[in-house]
């Protein structure tokens, strides 16, 4: 799996999308987990409704929400009030029994809020897009990691 980078601004919301084959993953619940270290386990953050037919209902765990368009094949995770400690490697997963298939590996990067750091110089931050379900503005941009890029910094 390639890793997709999603960048968001601290204090704002970041929306992560994970497309998948709706027929291949029919009837399967989904989850969002955080990778603990390069070879560590993926720790569950939030999962979709325990009734698959209600997967579109937004489920929250703290500031993280998940919702699944099972017909369209898109899992959406919202990280509300993004903080620096939210940065890291995550996975979108499709669950079957005690097993989990990785739908997408995601690297979340948190950018400083330029309003809080006016001397940040040429700090780049993404454009705005209106969220359908919430009145607040979502910031997100994604790219795939280039070959050779490492999602985790080397440990000494």
């Amino acid at each position: 799996h390639n890793t997709t980078v999603f960048q968001g601004v601290a204090g704002q919301s970041l929306q992560v999308s994970c497309p998948y084959d709706s027929m291949k993953h029919w009837g399967r619940r989904k989850a969002w987990c955080r990778q603990l270290g390069e070879k560590g386990p993926c720790q569950r953050v939030v999962s979709t409704h325990n009734l698959w037919l209600l997967s579109f209902l937004r489920r929250w765990n703290g500031s993280t929400a998940i919702t699944d368009d099972t017909l369209g094949g898109t899992l959406t995770i919202t990280l509300r009030n993004l903080q620096p400690h939210d940065a890291g490697l995550y996975q979108c997963q499709s669950l079957h029994g005690s097993e989990a298939d990785t739908l997408r590996k995601v690297l979340v990067e948190v950018l400083a809020d330029p309003l809080d750091h006016r001397d940040a110089g040429d700090l780049w931050f993404p454009g705005e897009s209106e969220s359908f379900e919430d009145a607040h503005v979502e910031h997100s941009i994604s790219r795939s990691l280039l070959e050779g890029e490492i999602p985790f910094p080397p440990t000494s």
């Epitope: 409704h49 009734l51 037919l53 209600l54 209902l57 937004r58 929250w60 368009d69 099972t70 369209g72």
Partner: antibody
Framework: EVQLVESGGGLVQPGRSLRLSCTAS????????MSWFRQAPGKGLEWVGF??????????EYTASVKGRFTISRDGSKSIAYLQMNSLKTEDTAVYYC?????????????????WGQGTMVTVSS | DIQMTQSPSSLSASVGDRVTITCQAS??????LNWYQQKPGKAPKLLIY???NLETGVPSRFSGSGSGTDFTFTISSLQPEDIATYYC????????FGGGTKVEIK
């Protein structure tokens, strides 16, 4: 008039089977999730299970106590939802209701049930 | 499973009284809660969905509020035809009902 009518209830011995029917009229049956509930004599309401709209291809969900014994199905051409009950137990004795899930859009619905049938009594006894 | 504790289990009030029923969830259920009315020998009737939305055709004296774990159902002015048992139903995790509140006229 939007209506649901259950049928098929009756007296049955433990371990036997029974099939309930829920005939819908007055609305586009294929567009709605359909659910079954039950109410034991003098008790509260209990969700049994439901089946998704046609878009969800007959996918079903059940409460733990009936999983593996009960099966919900639907026939869009007849606008009928079924509850097939196998290996019946005395604790399955109840009035069984079918109900329609409230629909928001093609994809979204809410498990609020806005149309109910009159109910059919199922008695499991030897 | 999520437990729904409904209170009181029964109440007696006069016509015109304001009646309040509460439903407490054993964990946060957002606003994933509905309220039903059931008259003796009849099927339940949906009154309120998603905690606070009044179902079409339901009189405006019925209302619902709350989010998280604590929810309230109110009849602003009790009418004789409101004699029934009222149930809350959550759908945050599976579907479960409260034990019901039987409303009678004094």
């Amino acid at each position: 008039e939007v209506q649901l009518v259950e049928s098929g209830g009756g007296l049955v011995q433990p371990g036997r089977s029974l099939r309930l029917s829920c005939t819908a009229s007055g609305f586009t049956f294929d567009d709605h999730a359909m659910s079954w509930f039950r109410q034991a004599p003098g008790k509260g309401l209990e969700w049994v299970g439901f089946i998704g709209s046609k878009a969800y291809g007959g996918t079903t969900e059940y409460t733990a106590s009936v999983k593996g014994r009960f099966t919900i199905s639907r026939d869009g051409s007849k606008s009928i939802a079924y509850l097939q009950m196998n290996s019946l137990k005395t604790e399955d004795t109840a009035v069984y209701y079918c109900a329609r899930g409230k629909r928001y859009s093609y994809t979204y619905w809410t498990p609020a049930f806005d149309v109910w049938g009159q109910g059919t009594m199922v008695t499991v006894s030897s | 499973d999520i437990q729904m504790t409904q209170s009181p289990s029964s109440l007696s009030a006069s016509v015109g009284d304001r009646v309040t029923i509460t439903c407490q969830a054993s964990q946060d259920i957002t606003n994933y809660l509905n309220w039903y009315q059931q008259k003796p020998g009849k099927a339940p009737k949906l009154l309120i969905y998603d905690a606070s939305n009044l179902e079409t055709g339901v009189p405006s004296r019925f209302s619902g509020s709350g989010s998280g774990t604590d929810f309230t159902f109110t009849i602003s002015s009790l009418q004789p035809e409101d004699i029934a048992t009222y149930y809350c139903q959550q759908y945050d995790s599976y579907l479960t009902f409260g034990g019901g509140t039987k409303v009678e006229i004094k």
